[in-house]
Interface confidence: low
């Protein structure tokens, strides 16, 4: 029987009446057009909704937008369009919401063709009031807030100028011309690339990388012959053109670009690309595209300096530069990532790693599922997850996989069960242990979201027809109740809940269509009365993450330590609450070879945990580039995995000596850098 239909599923008591009392409809007085929604701050209940409607006239497009504000999580909305002087807001810039709980909002207005500059509306009180400011430039990008100080904004202009404001957009100053890309780093530092000759496109591969640490008073050139750059965790990456040909290589800095090391990664040609898939302060996952239009490449994982890389996964699906990859960080369990590979027969298969890229395996077949026709053996197959690539291919997949840091172990995704991803209609699967085991949760495609840190899961069927039913589960997707939230079905467009999955409110967005008009409508349902009481100690149970063999003393050890969590019992129907904090108890493990990656010049043969010397380097001194100097490495082939906390046990020896020689292979050596002041 389908999930939620078997006998042991009890019904949540009186839920229809409880939900009916907590269902709030809001009909927006708008023609349909487009709608965008932003949450302002954390746990404030403030939502801004911008509706825009375009009427194409013969000569030009006439646009109208309206701004609405809610301060009760979407139950009621107030039209505040007059606060922005009924101005048409440019949706391509969205609503720029300030970091943390700054309460800052910037809206970029549409201005007439001949104007000197653009116009913004600024609020620093959670959109209660707005100030209109005329800009001395036309913005090309959305205003970017400094992560450290929400008063500091940067923007690029349509003329490729880099503009900075130090007083939350009140006054602007152009600090550099001919800028291609700009990003905030840490400590209010700005990194940007500039072109010298024609344009960003013409100078690709000949750009300069600059840094300013004082908002444009002084500058330092930290790289030349730059193709592109990126920031990830504490790493600054630049892809740099080689001196002799059209290939380029990745260089890495961990000191804001003062010194650079060449990453031990393959170089790429003109048609290839590098992509930072994920990065934290410990390490980085890097995708390196294969030559030719193959649609795949190789994932490498870095050491703690971002310099030495280990091959992690072959034939990793990544279509083109800026294209689609299914790489997903499962945020509900440490060390877990899911992605897709393109197999030799061009089928797409899902792989999962539980140890931050050390080993990849197929997803275990769900207990309650049969292998589909893609499976050669009807008894042996795997779960394959639909993510960005399937969505880009217009498969019937309304949502990417979902996990939340505070809903420990829960992963929800569309998938099919076989030897590869199937083109047939997917079902929804859930894992409650971070991806080790899976269960079919819902038949057919659905939208889904997690509320109350996993205490409630909400889903809506993906249908081309109007809908009026929402499903919810209080036991991590085992049993489902259905609630008819309106008598008049709506054309559903999206589910919205406050980011962070702590809320108990869900908003269902859609539109109604009558003979002549269609209108936006939202239904906000508060589940607080379904979870009648606050959870107590007895509602939680101890769960050991990554546990695969309870008999083994090292069971649950991943990256050198194991973690026990307090998790809500599936049978408990209670509120974790907005202040819920994940309770975990870490304990350190003994080191084994699994806690080390292979050092520069070494590799792991397949299905072996020992690192062996690369044949071409046998008997040679291991010399490599570090911070523009040549280093001599004495190693028996192992280097601790970044973030690994193991102690005792195996302890391979490693020593690095400075050879006091300059590296000729490093294009970003210090003598090529210079400084200037404004």
């Amino acid at each position: 029987s389908a999930p939620g239909e078997d006998e042991e599923c009890g019904r949540v008591r009186d839920f229809v009446a409880k939900l009916a009392n907590n269902t709030h409809q809001h009909v927006f007085d708008d023609l349909r057009g487009s709608v965008s929604l932003s949450w302002v701050g954390d746990s404030t209940g403030v939502i801004l909704v911008l509706t825009t409607f375009h009427v194409p006239l013969v000569i030009m497009t006439f646009g109208q937008s309206k701004l609405y504000r809610s301060e009760d999580y979407g139950k009621n909305f107030k039209d505040i369009t007059d606060l922005i002087n009924n101005t048409f807001i440019r949706t391509e810039f969205g609503m720029a919401i300030g970091p943390e709980n700054s309460g800052k909002v910037v809206l970029t207005a549409e201005v007439s063709g001949g104007s000197r500059g653009g116009r913004i509306f600024r609020s620093s009180d959670f959109a209660k009031n707005f100030v209109q400011t005329d800009l001395p430039f036309h913005p090309l990008t959305q205003m970017m807030y400094s992560p450290q100080n929400s008063d500091y904004l940067l923007a690029l202009s349509t003329e490729n100028g880099l503009w900075v404001s130090k007083n939350f957009g009140g006054k602007w100053e152009e600090i550099h011309k001919a800028v291609c890309l700009a990003k905030w780093g840490s400590d209010n530092t700005i990194f940007f690339t500039t072109y010298a000759n024609g344009s960003c496109k013409a100078d690709l591969g000949a750009l300069e990388l600059w840094r300013t640490s004082d908002l444009g008073k002084s500058f330092k050139t930290i790289g030349v012959k730059i193709y592109s750059f990126g920031l990830g965790g504490r790493f600054l990456f630049a892809s740099v053109m080689a001196d002799k040909d059209t290939t380029r290589r990745i260089h890495v800095s961990t000191d804001q670009g003062d010194t650079w090391s060449m990453a031990q990664l393959p170089s790429v040609g003109q048609e290839q690309f590098y992509s930072i898939l994920a990065a934290n302060d410990d390490m980085v996952f890097m995708h390196v595209d294969e030559p030719g239009d193959t649609g795949f490449g190789t994932i490498f994982t870095s050491d703690d300096r971002g310099i030495v890389y280990s091959k992690s996964l072959d034939r990793h699906l990544y279509t083109t530069t800026g294209g689609e990859t299914d790489f997903t960080n499962v945020t509900s369990l440490r060390g877990v990532y899911i992605t897709s590979v393109l197999s030799e027969d061009n089928s797409i298969q899902t792989m999962i790693t539980f140890d931050q890229g050390g080993r990849w395996t197929h997803l275990r077949k769900p207990e309650n599922s049969e292998c589909d026709a893609t499976a050669k053996n009807k008894n042996e197959c795997s779960l394959h997850i639909h993510a960005s690539y399937s969505i880009s291919q217009k498969l019937n997949v309304p949502m990417a996989p979902l996990s939340e840091p505070n809903a420990v172990g829960i992963v929800i995704a569309h998938g099919s069960v076989g030897d590869a991803i199937s083109v047939m209609v997917p079902d929804v699967y859930i894992s409650d242990d971070g991806g080790y085991s899976w269960t079919k949760m819902l038949e057919g495609p659905h939208y889904y979201t997690i509320l109350d840190s996993g205490g409630i899961i909400v889903a809506i069927e993906h249908s081309s027809r109007p809908i009026n039913v929402i499903k919810f589960s209080t036991d991590e997707g085992q049993c489902w109740q259905t609630y008819t939230f309106t008598r008049d079905p709506i054309y559903f467009t999206g589910l919205a809940s406050e980011p962070g999955a702590r809320s108990m409110n869900i908003s269902i967005w859609g539109f109604t269509e009558s003979f002549l008009t269609s209108q936006w409508v939202s239904y906000t349902i508060d589940f607080k009365d379904i979870l009648e009481r606050n959870c107590e100690e007895k509602d939680y149970t101890i769960w050991l993450a990554h546990s695969t063999d309870p008999e083994d003393y090292e069971d649950g050890c991943i990256l050198g330590y194991k973690e026990q969590f307090l998790r809500l019992r599936k049978s408990s129907v209670c509120q974790n609450g907005r202040d819920y904090v994940v309770t975990k108890q870490p304990s350190i493990c003994l080191c084994s070879l699994e806690d080390f990656l292979c050092d520069f010049g070494y590799y792991r043969p397949e299905n072996d945990s020992k690192c062996v010397e690369q044949p071409e380097l046998k008997g040679h001194d291991l010399e490599f580039c570090l911070y523009g100097r040549e280093e001599h490495l004495t190693t028996n082939g192992y280097r601790k995995i970044p973030g690994d906390k193991c102690q005792g046990g195996v302890n391979p020896v490693r020593e690095v000596k400075d050879l006091k020689k300059k590296c000729t292979s490093n294009f970003l050596s210090p003598e090529k850098q210079n400084s200037k002041s404004n």
């Epitope: 061009n346 399937s390 291919q393 217009k394 199937s422 083109v423 047939m424 209609v425």
Partner: antibody
């Protein structure tokens, strides 16, 4: 316009093999799955499987696994279905039918070949 | 495998009649259902896909409805050209399966 033209009727003895061809025109051959469906005299329709002309990947119905081989020649936009170890109950009209584009849920058949009658008789 | 059961297997009707054919799936197939018409010696012709979407060029007297496990093909006013056999087909999961067919004959 889209056309699927199949090879002519065949008479085979039990235990033999038959190979039916299906030449596609009027669309990008490699962009769409090619399915094979058969129909025994006076009976309903039975799906046999598909081939992805782009990759050569196949997907056969369990019933035909081990006896059917689907191949393609992209240079001449032709798909083939070979059925081996023929039995008298394999007597049927065999159709090729164009499925949906790759990675789309559209496995209904807008375009069909004219059918090839395969008679298995001793 | 998903079984598709069509009823009736034979249906006698006259020109101008409203005709309804039913197709039942052994498990939910959402809206992933197609209807075909087949005449003797000819290949099937697609009429309806995704349960209710009319294939272009098909007369509007044909319509489809239903979702989950129960589906219906309706011919609002039977024409001489409509006497044929009709098949439903699910494409929710492999193997793709067809109903046994409904023969619409002249009364």
């Amino acid at each position: 316009q889209v056309q699927l033209v199949q090879s002519g009727a065949e008479v085979k003895k039990p235990g033999a093999s038959v190979k039916v061809s299906c030449k596609a025109s009027g669309y990008t051959f490699t962009g769409y799955y090619m399915h094979w469906v058969r129909q025994a005299p006076g009976q309903g329709l039975e799906w046999m499987g598909w081939i992805n002309p782009n990759s050569g990947g196949t997907n056969y119905a369990q019933k035909f696994q081990g006896r059917v081989t689907m191949t393609r020649d992209t240079s001449i936009s032709t798909a083939y279905m070979e059925l081996s170890r023929l039995r008298s109950d394999d007597t049927a009209v065999y159709y090729c039918a164009r499925g949906g584009p790759q990675l789309r849920v559209a496995e209904y058949f807008q375009h069909w070949g004219q059918g090839t009658l395969v008679t298995v008789s001793s | 495998d998903i079984q598709m059961t069509q009823s009736p297997s034979t249906l006698s009707a006259s020109v101008g009649d409203r005709v309804t054919i039913t197709c039942r799936a052994s498990q939910s197939i959402s809206s992933w259902l197609a209807w075909y018409q087949q005449k003797p010696g000819k290949a099937p012709k697609l009429l309806i896909y995704k349960a209710s979407s009319l294939e272009s060029g098909v007369p509007s007297r044909f319509s489809g409805s239903g979702s989950g496990t129960e589906f219906t093909l309706t011919i609002s006013s039977l024409q001489p050209d409509d006497f044929a056999t009709y098949y439903c087909q699910q494409y929710k999961s492999y193997p793709i399966t067809f109903g046994g067919g409904t023969k619409v004959e002249i009364k």
